[in-house]
C-alpha cells in the first residue's frame, strides 16, 4: 500500500516506523497520532481506538507533538528584577528576562534561573568589559592619567584634563583641577557611559528558592557567595 | 557542532550496487531520524526514505522499496544506505540530512556523495 | 504523492529588492512547509519550517506565509550572499516532496 494511506491506530509493517506525527504505542502494538502543541493525551490509543487529545489546561503548556498524559505547568511569574519576554500560552512557558542593569548569573535550558545586579565600579576603577545578557561588568583600576569619580555599571576611565597651571593634580577617582585660567584642553562635559546590554535571547526564571512545577532538563547548580571583584560595589 | 560527514565521490559500473556512509557527531544520535535525499545533475531533490537509529527501522518512499537498504551503526553514530542494480539515471549526489518527524524537515545536512553510473 | 509546484523557476533581483518566491501543493498541506537555501555545490539549508518559523541563526529578511495549499517564501532585502537556488517542501504526506527550485540571481 502507498505511504500514509492507513488511518491511526495501524500495525507498522515489520521494521517500519510510524508516519510523521505519530507514535508506536508499546501496549497496543499500533501506530497512533502523537496530540498537537497545545494538547495532551486524555485517552491513549488501544488497537481499536485512536489517541484522545485534550487542550491543555489554564496554566499549563506542551511545546512539542506528544503523547503525555499532563500538559506541563508553566514556571512561576517573573521576579522584579526581571521581564516577561513571553506569556505562558498552551503551547509556550512562560519566558523572564532580566531587566535593564542586571544579568543572567545562571542560566537554564531556556531564561534564567537567576538575575543578579551589574557589578558597578567604584570611583577610582572604570569599566573594562561591559556586562551583557549573561556575564558582569569587569572593572579596572585607572590608570595614571585616567580617573573615574562615579560608582556606575557603565561609566569608563577618563582622561584628566590638561591645564596650564594644575590647582589640584587629578588622580584616579578625581579629575584635575585647573586654576583659573582656563584648561588647554578638557574633556566633553559628563560621564562617558558605555551601552547598557540589551537582553534579547529567551529567558525565564524562577524568583523563589522553591522549586517550579515546570519539569526542567537543566539543573539548578549550586552557587555560593562569590567576592566582589576589586574596584566593585554591592548595591 | 552537529554535523554529519558523508563518504567520498564514488564511480560505478550499471548494475551494480554501492553503500555510502554518514557520520553523526555532536548530538544524540539514536534520537533524530537519518534521511537520505539524492539530487541527480541539475535537478531537484528526491526523498529516499528514513532510518530511525535507536531501532533500525525505516521508512521509504515507495520508488525506492527494493531499490535502497539504510542501515546503521550505532556504535559508531553512522548511517548508511546502499543502492543496488545501478542504472545511469541513479547517477546523482546523495544526501544524509537529520530529520524532524513532527513538522517533516531536515535540519542538519551532510555534505553529499557524489554517486556516477557510467559503463 | 503530493506535488509541489514553484514559481518562478528563475529570477532576477538586485541588492536590496524584495524578493517573492510562491509555492502551491497539490492538495492541502495544513502549515507543514519548509524551505531551503542551496547554494552551488553545496547542500540545502533549512531556512523555514512550519509555514513561518525561522531556524535558528537565519537571518530575520528570511519569512514565510501561507496556509493551505499556497505559500510565499519572502527575502525583505536582497543581499549578495543570498544568490542560490530556494526550495519548497511539504511535510505533511509521506513521501516528503520538494518544488523544483528557484533560482535567484543578481541583477
Known amino acids: 500500500l502507498p505511504a500514509q494511506v492507513a488511518f491511526t491506530p495501524y500495525a507498522p509493517e515489520p521494521g517500519s516506523t510510524c508516519r510523521l506525527r505519530e507514535y508506536y504505542d508499546q501496549t497496543a502494538q499500533m501506530c497512533c497520532s502523537k496530540c498537537s502543541p497545545g494538547q495532551h493525551a486524555k485517552v491513549f490509543c488501544t488497537k481499536t481506538s485512536d489517541t484522545v487529545c485534550d487542550s491543555c489546561e489554564d496554566s499549563t503548556y506542551t511545546q512539542l507533538w506528544n503523547w503525555v498524559p499532563e500538559c506541563l505547568s508553566c514556571g512561576s511569574r517573573c521576579s522584579s528584577d526581571q521581564v516577561e519576554t513571553q506569556a505562558c500560552t498552551r503551547e509556550q512557558n512562560r519566558i523572564c528576562t532580566c531587566r535593564p542593569g542586571w544579568y543572567c548569573a545562571l542560566s537554564k535550558q531556556e531564561g534564567c534561573r537567576l538575575c543578579a545586579p551589574l557589578r558597578k565600579c567604584r570611583p577610582g576603577f572604570g569599566v573594562a568589559r561591559p556586562g551583557t545578557e549573561t556575564s558582569d561588568v569587569v572593572c579596572k583600576p585607572c590608570a595614571p592619567g585616567t580617573f573615574s569619580n562615579t560608582t556606575s555599571s557603565t561609566d569608563i576611565c577618563r582622561p584628566h584634563q590638561i591645564c596650564n597651571v594644575v590647582a589640584i593634580p587629578g588622580n584616579a577617582s578625581m579629575d584635575a583641577v585647573c586654576t583659573s585660567t582656563s584648561p588647554t584642553r578638557s574633556m566633553a562635559p559628563g560621564a562617558v557611559h558605555l551601552p547598557q546590554p540589551v537582553s534579547t535571547r529567551s529567558q525565564h526564571t524562577q524568583p523563589t528558592p522553591e522549586p517550579s512545577t515546570a519539569p526542567s532538563t537543566s539543573f539548578l547548580l549550586p552557587m555560593g557567595p562569590s567576592p566582589p571583584a576589586e574596584g566593585s560595589t554591592g548595591d | 557542532q552537529v554535523q554529519l560527514v558523508q563518504s567520498g565521490a564514488e564511480v560505478k559500473k550499471p548494475g551494480a550496487s554501492v553503500k555510502l556512509s554518514c557520520k553523526a557527531s555532536?548530538?544524540?544520535?539514536?534520537?533524530?531520524?537519518i534521511n537520505w535525499v539524492r539530487q541527480a545533475p541539475g535537478q531537484g531533490l528526491e526523498w529516499i526514505g528514513w532510518i530511525y537509529p535507536r531501532d533500525g527501522n525505516t521508512q521509504f518512499n515507495e520508488n525506492f522499496k527494493g531499490k535502497a537498504t539504510m542501515t546503521v551503526d550505532e556504535s559508531t553514530s553512522t548511517a548508511y544506505m546502499e543502492v543496488r542494480s545501478l542504472r545511469s539515471d541513479d547517477t546523482a549526489v546523495y544526501y544524509c540530512?537529520?530529520?524532524?518527524?513532527?513538522?517533516?524537515?531536515?535540519?542538519?545536512w551532510g555534505q553529499g556523495t557524489t554517486v556516477t553510473v557510467s559503463s | 504523492d503530493i506535488q509541489m509546484t514553484q514559481s518562478p523557476s528563475s529570477l532576477s533581483a538586485s541588492v536590496g529588492d524584495r524578493v517573492t518566491i510562491t509555492c502551491q501543493a497539490s492538495q492541502d498541506i495544513s502549515n507543514y512547509l519548509n524551505w531551503y537555501q542551496q547554494k552551488p555545490g553545496k547542500a540545502p539549508k533549512l531556512l523555514i519550517y512550519f509555514k513561518s518559523k525561522l531556524e535558528t541563526g537565519v537571518p530575520s529578511r528570511f519569512s514565510g506565509s501561507g496556509s493551505g495549499t499556497d505559500f510565499t517564501f519572502t527575502i525583505s532585502s536582497l543581499q549578495p550572499e543570498d544568490i542560490a537556488t530556494y526550495y519548497c517542501?511539504?511535510?505533511?504526506?509521506?513521501?516528503?516532496?520538494f518544488g523544483g527550485g528557484t533560482k535567484l540571481e543578481i541583477k
Open positions: 517542501q511539504q511535510g505533511n504526506t509521506l513521501p516528503l516532496t
Open positions: 555532536g548530538y544524540t544520535f539514536i534520537t533524530y531520524d
Open positions: 540530512a537529520r530529520g524532524d518527524r513532527d513538522y517533516g524537515y531536515f535540519d542538519v
